[in-house]
Interface confidence: low
Amino acid sequence: QGNRWRRSKRASYVSNPICKGCLSCSKDNGCSRCQQKLFFFLRREGMRQYGECLHSCPSGYYGHRAPDMNRCARCRIENCDSCFSKDFCTKCKVGFYLHRGRCFDECPDGFAPLEETMECVEGCEVGHWSEWGTCSRNNRTCGFKWGLETRTRQIVKKPVKDTILCPTIAESRRCKMTMRHCPGGKRTPKAKEKRNKKKKRKLIERAQEQHSVFLATDRANQ
């Protein structure tokens, strides 16, 4: 059909730069078949489309080798800008991170985003959390109502770049002490002091309350 005409007229268009590397070419549509090892690429300019034979495919396309003809096929990987093969992305769209040939809006667990290259690189690997430690305060496990307990985890693998931060390796939480009073009945002087202060504060508060009640009833009677 149409190709027969193109083949017979091929010689006329050999000088046309669009026909470089072509086996079959027309003035209007450019290449329709390429020499071996070259990739057929359909270029679009406005309403016009024409075929080209390229050594490598442009961005957003990959070289699909086939027995009949090698073609530039569009990257069909989600959020991919350019790819190396049908299922391996080499550059993601803006806002997406490249990880093992795919594009992610955030890096998978164990990987950290490298903003300069928009890639997911091996992050800081940490071990499992230890059990929560003993509830203590001021290095004491008694004598207070509340204390803090801590747990830790180890850095198993340091990140590939210093700019990548490791997740927290120690955390603490408030806890209720099992023994509010220390054995032997002795209270710490500080605790005694605090208790006296608390008593004093309560007395003052009560006095103030009574004073405000007196003022209120006095105003009401006027």
Epitope: Q1, G2, M47, R48, A73, R74, K86, D87
Partner: antibody, heavy 119, light 109 residues
Framework: QIQLQESGPGLVKPSQSLSLTCSVT????????WSWIRQFPGKKLEWMGY???????YYNPSLENRISITRDTSKNQFFLHLKSVTTEDTATYYC?????????????WGQGIQVTVSS | ELVFTQPQSVSGSLGQEISISCTRS????????VSWYQQQSSNKPRLLIY?????PSGVPDRFSGSTDSSSNSGILTISRLQPEDEGDYYC????????FGSGTQLTLL
């Protein structure tokens, strides 16, 4: 000569999954791209998704969360799986060979299989 | 959403020439290839035209494809109408997501 044949259940209950098989003869499924297309009772055609020669898939965004296309290269078959079907999925389902990108056309079609979704 | 609109029905007499349009709702018709399919009495669709104007072997030269940039449409022309041309005709285009036209029923008068 390339031939495609769809097979699977003709009747599926709502909320169940639909699974269809396309058996290909005369062409290795690892050397071409393959699509599933359906035709609704009102004759409207809808492209559902495709699997390329390497096993990569691409789906119609309107079906993306319900569809998956898989294959068995040893049997030269590819499959359509559609989850949570409703009566709206009642259609004739075709498998077809898709010609390489960017040409976007289907040159060989199966006979089609009528699937009714009803309780 | 990309839509390709076709006339619901066209009719013609034996030996006559008819055209079916496939109008793209947004973007240029030339941005992606258009292919055409014929479906007779609920049989499977058959490829008639691909890459705008190419005919697969076995398809008579009475069928031809073209584009009309002024109406942003792909056009299927059938010349010298035959009784066996009766049926439904669909266009297909798109890039990542393929979209079929709404379909046209061809009736011979």
């Amino acid at each position: 000569q390339i031939q495609l044949q769809e097979s699977g259940p003709g009747l599926v209950k709502p909320s169940q999954s639909l699974s269809l098989t396309c058996s290909v003869t005369g062409n290795s499924i690892t050397s071409s791209d393959w699509s599933w297309i359906r035709q609704f009772p009102g004759k409207k055609l809808e492209w559902m998704g495709y699997m390329n020669y390497g096993g990569g898939t691409y789906y119609n965004p309107s079906l993306e969360n319900r569809i998956s296309i898989t294959r068995d290269t040893s049997k030269n078959q590819f499959f359509l799986h559609l989850k949570s079907v409703t009566t709206e999925d009642t259609a004739t389902y075709y498998c077809a060979r898709e010609r390489p990108h960017p040409y976007a056309y289907f040159d060989v079609w199966g006979q089609g299989i009528q699937v009714t979704v009803s309780s | 959403e990309l839509v390709f609109t076709q006339p619901q029905s066209v009719s013609g007499s034996l030996g006559q020439e008819i055209s079916i349009s496939c109008t793209r709702s947004s973007g240029n018709i030339g941005s992606n290839y258009v292919s055409w399919y014929q479906q007779q009495s609920s049989n499977k669709p058959r490829l008639l035209i691909y890459k705008f104007d190419q005919r697969p072997s076995g398809v008579p030269d009475r069928f031809s494809g073209s584009t009309d940039s002024s109406s942003n449409s792909g056009i299927l022309t059938i010349s010298r109408l035959q009784p066996e041309d009766e049926g439904d005709y669909y266009c297909l285009s798109g890039y990542d997501k393929y979209v079929f036209g709404s379909g046209t029923q061809l009736t011979l008068l």
